[in-house]
């Protein structure tokens, strides 16, 4: 298990990449002047007391940052949200802090990340650009689920 | 508001079982963890185990490991424990307990009102 | 098995500051331990009063709080009030499981 986050890049399948406006997490065009975050990514220590065949779970926050995605309910369906937070404070927690956990399932060089507290629903993109990330349960219709990781070293 | 209410007290005979029922309201507990605690007359706290009620995975103290079993019924929002082989250093309250991730941190912030098991023969 | 140890008994005058505390056989407590405690008194329910260390839960006086001192997890009650009169138990995260103390007797007299 690793005991330091992992930076990692990440883009959909479109060649958007992620980046940092107004507090909120958008996928923008790779340019020049993009400056893309960094994600950084540990897995929980708690694996063994979580579901089984799901994917790794882990905690995502932005490198340097003390910001850490989140999953929690506005009004009846859960939304994604960047939170103050140290990601090695969640990964030392006594259980998994489970609105900050993803599920993260590969397939070839395809990447998803399934939210841990609302089974489900994953991390997504709208087919358009400028658009902010957000939780889905519509795989592969309008919005975009699959994503590149490259690490970072 | 949130609250715990556990089944009535138990009388057993040692070798026996007891299975300790724990209802929850006011809160989803898919969203929290729920612990077991017990206390032998005069004596201190001491930690069984909990249950994670979304996933129904266990943890337990290793002194309890293999006497204890915990489990949960998400449609009834009940949890259960039950303990077994149990000899006369049993008798106690059991508890059980919520611990929730509030803020920055997990507190055992709710616990049931507890249920008196005594083992005599 | 660590053991977690607590004073048994402490009285604190009305308005005064008592600190108790909760020690660990297996050497100093640390914020890895993630300290909680929960405060018990006579017929009512138990209630938590701290966790991960120096966090007080919601709805928590201002005067209680948690800390470390000299290697132990402490509780510190400022100010103390006649219905603080109660069983103090702490409890302390190793690794995979949780162990409480025995307790501490808190007379407000």
């Known amino acids: 298990k690793s005991e330091m986050p992992q930076p990692v890049s990440i883009q959909d399948i479109n060649h958007r990449v992620w980046v940092l406006q107004d507090q909120i997490l958008i996928a923008v065009p790779r340019k020049d002047r993009v400056s893309p975050v960094t994600i950084s990514l540990i897995s929980c220590r708690h694996v063994e007391t979580l579901e089984k065949d799901r994917g790794n779970p882990i905690y995502l926050g932005l490198n340097g940052l003390n910001l850490c995605l989140m999953c929690a309910k506005a009004g009846d369906q859960p939304t994604l949200q960047l939170k103050e937070k140290d990601i090695m404070d969640l990964y030392n927690q006594p259980e998994p802090v489970k609105s900050f956990l993803f599920y993260h399932s590969q397939s070839g060089r395809n990447s998803t990340f399934e939210s841990v507290a609302f089974p489900g629903w994953f991390i997504a993109v709208s087919s358009e650009g400028g658009c902010p990330l957000i939780l889905t349960q519509e795989l592969g219709k309008a919005n975009t689920t699959d994503f590149g990781l490259t690490m970072l070293f | 508001q949130v609250q715990l209410v556990q089944s009535g007290a138990e009388v057993k005979k040692p070798g026996a079982s007891v299975k300790v029922s724990c209802k929850a309201s006011?809160?989803?507990?898919?969203?929290?963890?729920i612990h077991w605690v017990r206390q032998a007359p005069g004596q201190g706290l001491e930690w069984i185990g909990r249950?994670?009620?979304?996933?129904?995975?266990?943890r337990y103290d290793p002194k309890f490991q293999g006497r204890a079993t915990i489990t949960t019924d998400t449609s009834t929002s009940t949890v259960y424990l039950e303990f077994s082989s149990l000899r006369s250093e049993d008798t106690a309250v059991y508890y059980c307990?919520?611990?929730?991730?509030?803020?920055?941190?997990?507190?055992?912030?709710?616990w049931g009102q507890g249920t008196l098991v005594t083992v005599s023969s | 098995q660590a053991v977690v140890t607590q004073e048994p008994s402490l009285t604190v005058s009305p308005g005064g500051t008592v600190t108790l505390t909760c020690r660990s056989s297996?050497?100093?407590?640390?914020?890895?331990?993630?300290a909680n405690w929960v405060q018990e008194k006579p017929g009512q329910l138990f209630a938590g009063l701290i966790g991960?260390?120096?966090d007080r839960a919601p709805g928590v006086p201002a005067r209680f709080s948690g800390s470390l001192l000299g290697g132990k997890a402490a509780l510190t009650i400022s100010g103390a009030q006649p219905e603080d009169e109660a069983i103090y138990f702490c409890?302390?995260?190793?690794?995979?499981?949780?162990?409480f103390g025995g307790g501490t007797k808190l007379t407000v007299l």
């Open positions: 297996s050497g100093a407590v640390t914020t890895s331990n993630y």
């Open positions: 991960g260390t120096n």
């Open positions: 249950i994670d009620p979304a996933i129904g995975t266990t």
């Open positions: 006011g809160f989803n507990i898919k969203d929290t963890y």
């Open positions: 409890a302390l995260w190793f690794s995979n499981h949780w162990v």
């Open positions: 307990a919520r611990l929730h991730y509030f803020g920055n941190n997990f507190f055992f912030d709710y």
